[in-house]
Every structure is written in C-alpha cells, then in structure tokens.
C-alpha cells in the first residue's frame, strides 16, 4: 500500500543464501517470504541493499550461527552491519558479538542488530561476519532488511 | 495520534502469560504496559495477533528462557515467528536458536526476532518455542508485537 | 525528510559512552553515526531520551558485554529498558538476560531489546544494566534509539 506517489512505502526483507565465496560479506536472495516494496530499494549483487532516496531508515539484520570453542579461533563470532555511501568511507553502523559455544559438534546462537540511520541516495548497507561458514541458512534463521520511516 | 481516518496507526505490543497448556505456541495478554492501538489489530485466543488491513508490517518478538544442557534435549531452544493466512500454508517467518547453558539450575538467555512482512487481511502471527516451560515471564522478559508501516 | 510541519519525523540513535559513574544507568552520546532528527527528541544528561510529543514509539537498545562466570555474581547480566513519565512511577518496559560465559578472561555476548510503547509528552526512556563495567563500547556494539510511528 502506497503512502502516495510522492512518499511511497520503502521496505525490504531478504533471506540468507549459502555461498561458496570466501568473502566475509553475507549473501542474500529474494526467495521464500521476502519483501521488496518497489524499485526504490534493491538487492545488488546478492550482497547489499541499496536505497534511491535520502531519509531515515530502520535497518536490521539477524544472523544465526553454529560454532564450537575448540574448533574456532579464540576471537568471538561478530556480525557487523555496515554502510557504503557514494564518496565516503565505509562505516560500521552496528555490531554484535557472541563467544563460541562449548557444545559439540557446534552450538547454535542468534544475533539481532537494528537501528535508525540517515541514508543518502545511492547508499548501500551490507552484513559482515567473522566466519560465513558458521552461518545457519535454515528457514527463517538469517535475514536482513530495512524500512524507511 | 492518528494519521487520518483512512490511514490510522496500527500497532500492538503484548506481554507473555504463563500457561498450563502443553502447546508450543506461546500465550500473551493485554496486561502491564501493553499496546493495542485500535480494533484493526487484535489478540485472538491469547495466542495470535490478527490484522484486518493488508500492508507491510514490522513484526517482532522477544523471548527470554532459562535452560540447562543436561536437563534439556540435545536440540537447541528455538523460537519461531509464524504466519497464518486464510487459504495459505502456515509459514515460518523468522527463527532464532540458542544452545542450552551449562549454568545450574539453568542459565537465562534472550532471543529477539524482527522483520518486515506483507500481511493479508485476516492474517495472524504467533510465536512457537521448543519448550514453553523454559520461558521466563518476569516483567519485560518476553513480549510480542507489530506495527504497520 | 519531513512528513509535514504538523507531523515531522521523530527519531534518535545514540552511541554508548564509557563512564566512571557507578550508576547502573548506561551513558550515551551524540557521536559517530548518531541520529537526532530534531528537537522533538533529546538526549538528556547523556542518559535518557526524552520526547516532547505524545504517541506510539518503537524503542530499542542493543548492549554488548563481556563477562566471566567465575568473576561475576551468580545472577545473570540483565539489560532493562525503562520509562520515566512525569508524575508516574518508573517502569520496566523490556528486559533481557544472559548467563555469564565460561570463556576467559571474559566472553562477549549481545542483547537486543525492542518494542512499541505509548509515550506521554516529557516521557524519558533509559537503559539499566546489572554491571556497566562489563559493557563493550567498541564501534557499533552498544546503542540506543527510538522512532515515532
């Protein structure tokens, strides 16, 4: 439902996708019960949500992962919500950290990130994790989205 | 504050209620500092939030639970946000999983779920957990809500 | 972007600040990639977000902390989102609890709180934790905000 041609609703919710890439940037897809309100927000290269209009956005991500303390590095599992704006440095908007579980073979944990940020036209947001191979891609476990206020 | 008769604010926030039922669906109540904006969203049978208008909604749930690895099944504690729409499959919208704690008698953990979804008129959302007896019902620990964009 | 003079957007996102104070109330600052939409929401005394207009608000907080079971009290780490309204008792809106980690020297964990609440003019919201010395203040780890529906 539109608020009016001048002020349409802008929202997205995308679903995690397992990837063979070694990058720490999570991959997403428009599959399952996804949301893509219109072309004022787009999923680019399966990795970032890009907005066409300036404004305040509530941006969120949820990451479920399965890790084991002995099999992982000593550093915790960290999920970061990051921002790329044209002509600006990339920035970390939000981060969450969870120490690895002692459960075997691995222990599942879920992280939720969310906050209100001003985005410029052409700004992109993406999610980084310390070890993408530990991320759970079962139905509903890992997702990423935004809504324009 | 209303946006106008044609576009009233629609929001709800309900509070967890302990239940003697053996169902995995959590029970909720309009008690404490709850929110129920108007009759365009209702709490039905103490278990599901039902909306009358189609549109994009941000839906969230928070579940705090107390469990112990030895006393629990090997499977993690999972909270699921689910959707019922007339004439459609029930769906899992979001899930989070936390491995049980080794703390005794039990270790508390909190899960937060949230995302943007399109709901049809008459659609209902509800929260499932693997073991409702482990859920914490102290003030503020477990709640469920939505807001229409 | 404003909705109109009568109905401007109201939103805030503030960043955690380490404090030498012994109080359990977390301290916040307008620094880094913060949001403060206008003077209809203000950060007071670095500790509470205060709103000038009545209405429904989505309020959220994220707290990352690092603790160890042996070095901490037996009680879990609890984060509380609290409300102060003129002439009313303070109230707990939301709480989350996480048992301390067995990781050494400490194990990091993140908590996310969020919900929709009616606020009165002059109402303030703030975040309490059981042990502020355990809170992580690295970029993006701990933040607090709201948006008016």
């Amino acid at each position: 439902m539109q608020k009016g041609d001048q002020n349409p609703q802008i929202a997205a919710h995308v679903i995690s996708e397992a990837s063979s890439k070694t990058t720490s940037v999570l991959q997403w897809a428009e599959k399952g019960y996804y949301t893509m309100s219109n072309n004022l927000v787009t999923l680019e290269n399966g990795k970032q949500l890009t907005v066409k209009r300036q404004g305040l956005y509530y941006i969120y991500a949820q990451v479920t992962f399965c890790s084991n303390r002995e099999a992982s590095s000593q550093a915790p599992f960290i999920a970061s919500l990051c921002l790329k704006s044209p002509g600006r440095f990339e920035r970390i908007l939000l981060r969450a950290a969870n120490t690895h579980s002692s459960a075997k073979p691995c222990g599942q944990q879920s992280i939720h990130l969310g906050g209100v940020f001003e985005l410029q036209p052409g700004a992109s947001v993406f999610v980084n994790v310390t070890d993408p191979s530990q991320v759970s891609h079962g139905t509903g476990f890992t997702s990423f989205g935004l809504l324009k206020l | 504050m209303q946006k106008g008769d044609q576009n009233p604010q629609i929001a709800a926030h309900v509070i967890s209620e302990a239940s003697s039922k053996t169902t995995s669906v959590l029970q909720w109540a309009e008690k404490g500092y709850y929110t129920m904006s108007n009759n365009l969203v209702t709490l039905e049978n103490g278990k599901q939030l039902t909306v009358k208008r189609q549109g994009l909604y941000y839906i969230y749930a928070q579940v705090t639970f107390c469990s112990n690895r030895e006393a629990s099944s090997q499977a993690p504690f999972i909270a699921s946000l689910c959707l019922k729409s007339p004439g459609r499959f029930e769906r899992i919208l979001l899930r989070a999983a936390n491995t049980h704690s080794s703390a005794k008698p039990c270790g508390q953990q909190s899960i937060h779920l949230g995302g943007v979804f399109e709901l049809q008129p008459g659609a209902s959302v509800f929260v499932n957990v693997t073991d409702p007896s482990q859920v914490s019902h102290g003030t503020g620990f477990t709640s469920f809500g939505l807001l229409k964009l | 972007m404003q909705k109109g003079d009568q109905n401007p957007q109201i939103a805030a996102h503030v960043i955690s600040e380490a404090s030498s104070k012994t109080t359990s109330v977390l301290q916040w600052a307008e620094k880094g990639y913060y949001t403060m939409s206008n003077n209809l929401v203000t950060l007071e005394n670095g500790k509470q977000l205060t709103v000038k207009r009545q209405g429904l608000y989505y309020i959220y907080a994220q707290v990352t902390f690092c603790s160890n079971r042996e070095a901490s009290s037996q009680a879990p780490f609890i984060a509380s989102l609290c409300l102060k309204s003129p002439g009313r008792f303070e109230r707990i809106l939301l709480r989350a609890a996480n048992t301390h980690s067995s990781a050494k020297p400490c194990g990091q964990q993140s908590i996310h709180l969020g919900g929709v609440f009616e606020l009165q003019p002059g109402a303030s919201v703030f975040v309490n934790v059981t042990d502020p010395s355990q809170v992580s203040h690295g970029t993006g780890f701990t933040s607090f905000g709201l948006l008016k529906l």
Epitope: G32, Y33, T35 | E118 | -
Partner: nanobody, 123 residues
Framework: EVQLVESGGGLVQPGGSLRLSCAAS????????MGWFRQAPGKEREFVAV????????LYADSVKGRFTISADNSKNTAYLQMNSLKPEDTAVYYC????????????????WGQGTLVTVSS
C-alpha cells in the same frame, strides 16, 4: 508448473491410520514448500501441514498436531502425510499443494494443486 498426484485416501475406522502420498513432477526444482490442505463437505478449504524443501522444517494446524506427521523424500519428489488416531471430523478431501520459490511476501502467489483424495473416517 508442477503436477501433483495424491494417493492413499480411503475409508478408515476412528482411531485408525492412513498414509497419503503426493508425487510431484515437472519443475520440481522450483518447489519451496509442499503441504496439505483439506476440505470437508460444506466447509472452506483449511491448512493441515507443510514441509519446507530447504531444510525439512514443518508446521501443523492445531487440530492435527501430535496426530499427523508430514515428511518428504526429495529423491522421489514425494511428500507424505501420516495420519494417526483419526477422528470422524478428519473426514474431508485432502489436497496436496506446492508453493514455488521466490513468491515473496508481497505476492499472493498461485500454488500448484493436486486433484484431491477422499479420506472418510467412520465406523
């Protein structure tokens, strides 16, 4: 499009069991979820159970929880509904349905449907 063929319906006494099968053919790689609905005489079609192809997650209607079990054999592109402790109120035509990938939350995507199989619970 996906073609669905149900089998396994019939007459059974209260407390008895039946196993329904639903064989899928055609664009089976495009199936996101498979499940069952039922329609009793003079009533609307209602959801019974669903299984997600990605990870085997399942959901059930309250009325059948603990009695019915949905499962799938991906190698045979077949979904099953094991129905135990059957009651007279379970009498209905049972329809298999498949939901395609990428339907999205903003689209009321069309399901593919089977022709239905009749289950009668009576003594």
């Amino acid at each position: 499009e996906v073609q669905l063929v149900e089998s396994g319906g019939g007459l059974v006494q209260p407390g008895g069991s039946l196993r329904l099968s639903c064989a899928a053919s055609g664009r089976t790689s495009n199936i996101y979820a498979m499940g069952w609905f039922r329609q009793a005489p003079g009533k609307e079609r209602e959801f019974v159970a669903v299984i997600y192809s990605s990870d085997g997650s399942t959901l059930y209607a309250d009325s059948v929880k603990g009695r019915f079990t949905i499962s799938a054999d991906n190698s045979k592109n077949t979904a099953y509904l094991q129905m135990n402790s059957l009651k007279p109120e379970d009498t209905a035509v049972y329809y298999c349905a498949a939901e395609p990938y990428g339907s999205g939350s903003s689209l009321m995507s069309e399901y593919d449907w089977g022709q239905g199989t009749l289950v009668t619970v009576s003594s």
